[in-house]
Interface confidence: low
């Protein structure tokens, strides 16, 4: 390998290096590759040099494109026609000189917070891009469209948030915001201007015209209207609170809708149960006042008994299925009909036929195995399914099974 690299001169972004060649193993060295390592890099990285390609007869090079105020060490690797040799021992560690910062914070945004606050946030500039000691941020903001920027200096490289509090800040009003950088060398650039909204106030009016209806034993649907009159808080969506009559209101469940949606479905409820519901508008500041509470009773559960005694027979490209009638219990919804679900043995999608009889005729090709199941349906939803019946592919003209 080449002998240890010497750093002859260092600036904020360049380093002048020199080295002595090592043995070439009887094959002339054709080029040298310069590598650098910093506390922030993952291992050794190739760096750009002047000249761009360092030939085997050149023993000096200038490394360019370094970050200011970062500790570097360098090494060289020789190459010939046979391949790449062992790297040299690393140079001493040297820090580049300081310079004005050039990188601005990423993702300047904000919003939220408490009344009369403007919250501004950003991603901090990594240490290796701060270019010097005494790094900090300049937060500039102004009411949208105004001429004069208000400035705040935060002398901390770790700062990522600034909150401006003033009674004159109106709820959810737009501010133009930018965040600049500085260090001991002076001020760097500002980030692009972005629009950030001050903290909003929660909605001041409740939703109107609440209505709920039962869809099944487990599902209900709730409808409401936007608040009537001037609502001071922006509405981001609505929060529906619901609880069973037998439970306490403080244990109520909540679901949220987003945007203009003024209805929602609530699922996984208990059958034949009385539920109470109320609706509030919400935004990032919180929820507004609650609507009046409405009541709805879920429908009776569907029949628990599956269809039994299923008999099938086939002839003339038809499968005829018969089964016993399902009788609902007193606390169950009346049977309105039956769903016959069938699919080919090797096909995943299921077809459904509805009937209010206890038999059905299917016209199905006989060159496939079929899987069939039957379940009752009611106002309370679908009841229990029968066990799956496999009807094998039929080559003869008549077959039966149960």
């Amino acid at each position: 390998p080449p002998e240890a690299v010497t750093i002859d001169e260092i600036t904020d972004t360049t380093a002048q290096l020199s080295w002595r060649p090592g043995p070439d193993n009887h094959s002339p060295i054709t080029m040298y590759v310069i590598q650098a390592r910093t506390p922030f890099s993952v291992g050794w990285q190739a760096v750009n040099t002047v000249p761009d390609l360092v030939d085997g007869k050149t023993f000096t090079a200038t490394v360019v494109g370094l970050n200011p105020w970062v500790e570097y060490e360098f090494r060289t690797v020789a190459a010939n026609v046979i391949g790449i040799g062992e790297p040299s021992r690393p140079s001493e560690k040297r820090r580049t000189e300081e310079a004005l910062p050039e990188v601005t914070p990423a993702n300047v945004s904000g919003g939220g917070g408490s009344k009369s606050e403007l919250v501004i946030t950003w991603e901090t500039v990594p240490e290796e891009l701060q270019n010097g000691r005494g790094f900090g941020y300049v937060v500039a903001f102004r009411p949208h469209g105004k001429m004069i920027w208000m400035l705040t200096v935060l002398a901390s490289a770790d700062a990522s948030r600034y909150v401006f509090r003033n009674e004159s800040v109106r709820p959810f009003s737009p501010f133009e915001v930018k965040v600049g950088v500085f260090n001991n060398k002076g001020e760097g650039p500002f980030s692009p201007t972005t629009l950030v909204y001050s903290a909003e106030e929660e909605p001041t009016k409740p939703p109107a015209s609440i209505f709920a209806r039962s869809l099944s034993a487990t599902d209900i649907e709730v409808f409401w209207a936007s608040p009537i009159g001037k609502n001071r808080g922006r509405i981001q969506g609505y929060e529906v609170k619901y609880w069973r009559h037998d439970d306490k209101e403080e244990n109520a469940k909540k679901i949220r809708t987003v945007g203009n949606q003024t209805s929602t479905k609530i699922t996984n409820l208990k059958g034949s149960a009385l539920y109470h519901l109320s609706v509030k508008a919400y935004n990032s500041a919180g929820t507004g006042p609650s609507s009046a509470t409405v009541n709805v009773t879920t429908r009776k559960p569907p029949p628990s008994q599956p269809p039994g005694n299923i008999i099938w027979n086939s002839s003339d490209s038809k499968i005829i299925l018969n089964w016993d009638q399902v009788k609902a219990l007193d606390n169950e919804s009346e049977v309105k009909g039956y769903k016959v679900l069938y699919r080919w043995n090797r096909q995943s999608s299921t077809s459904v036929i509805e009937t209010n009889k206890t038999s059905v005729e299917l016209s199905l090709p006989f060159d496939e195995d079929y899987i069939i199941e039957i379940k009752p349906f009611s106002d309370g939803g679908d009841g229990s399914s029968s066990e799956q019946i496999r009807i094998p592919k039929i080559s003869n003209s008549y077959a039966r099974g149960s």
Partner: antibody
Framework: EVQLLESGGGLVQPGGSLRLSCAAS????????MFWVRQAPGKGLEWVAE????????WYAPAVKGRFTISRDNSKNTLYLQMNSLRAEDTAVYYC????????????????WGQGTLVTVSS | ELTQDPAVSVALGQTVRITCSGS???YGWYQQKPGQAPVLVIY???NRPSGIPDRFSGSSSGNTASLTITGAQAEDEADYYC?????????FGGGTKLTVL
């Protein structure tokens, strides 16, 4: 499909009054801020007035403040512009327009426009 | 006050950029063809409404917004207006007449 149909334009003398209407359909009218925007013959667009979805807040361009009144009747899905003390420089095609959002703060985004109604102020 | 160049021309299939400068932090762009109502083509500086071809794009830096049409078509010949907010009222730029050669 959003539809906005303006009416009420015509010829009026300087100092006179006119009331424009805009019938809206195809969206929840009361949920959206609405605008009037005008365009003088051969000229660019000029924002005239804005009203919040519930009708509680209104905003006006300096050139029309105190002379024009924007209002809405959410039960009829209709937007209005009452124009008083009309001047020759008010001559323009007046467009009814719908905001893109339920709420509009900062720069308005106009998602849909009517075809416009011509107002001519001349003696 | 939002400022636009009065007229810009572009060769068919080439790229053109229309700029708008002023004090607004959030811009929209509207296309208007003769005798028709305007159509929103870009909102909130960079977002394209559904139905608008992807050759239209928007950007913003500081107090300047740009509308770029990559691969201009004959049907893109129109007046283009930027819209924004000056802190108290909504405003439109003076408009840029785009000619496709």
């Amino acid at each position: 499909e959003v539809q906005l149909l303006e009416s009420g334009g015509g010829l009026v003398q300087p100092g006179g009054s006119l009331r424009l209407s805009c019938a809206a359909s195809g969206f929840t009218f009361s949920s959206f801020n609405m605008f009037w925007v005008r365009q003088a013959p051969g000229k660019g667009l000029e924002w005239v007035a804005e009203i919040s979805g519930g009708g509680g807040s209104t905003w006006y361009a300096p050139a029309v403040k105190g002379r024009f009144t924007i209002s809405r009747d959410n039960s009829k899905n209709t937007l209005y512009l009452q124009m008083n003390s009309l001047r020759a420089e008010d001559t323009a095609v007046y467009y009814c327009a719908k905001s893109a959002d339920t709420w509009s703060y900062g720069a308005a985004t106009i998602q849909a426009w009517g075809q416009g109604t011509l107002v001519t102020v001349s003696s | 006050e939002l400022t636009q160049d009065p007229a810009v021309s572009v060769a068919l299939g080439q790229t053109v950029r229309i700029t708008c400068s002023g004090s607004s932090g959030s811009y929209g762009w509207y296309q208007q063809k003769p005798g028709q109502a305007p159509v929103l083509v870009i909102y909130d500086n960079t977002n394209r409404p559904s139905g608008i071809p992807d050759r239209f794009s928007g950007s913003s830096s500081g107090n300047t917004a740009s509308l770029t049409i990559t691969g201009a078509q004959a049907e893109d010949e129109a007046d283009y207006y930027c819209g924004g907010y000056d802190g108290s009222t909504d405003v439109f730029g003076g408009g840029t007449k785009l000619t496709v050669l």
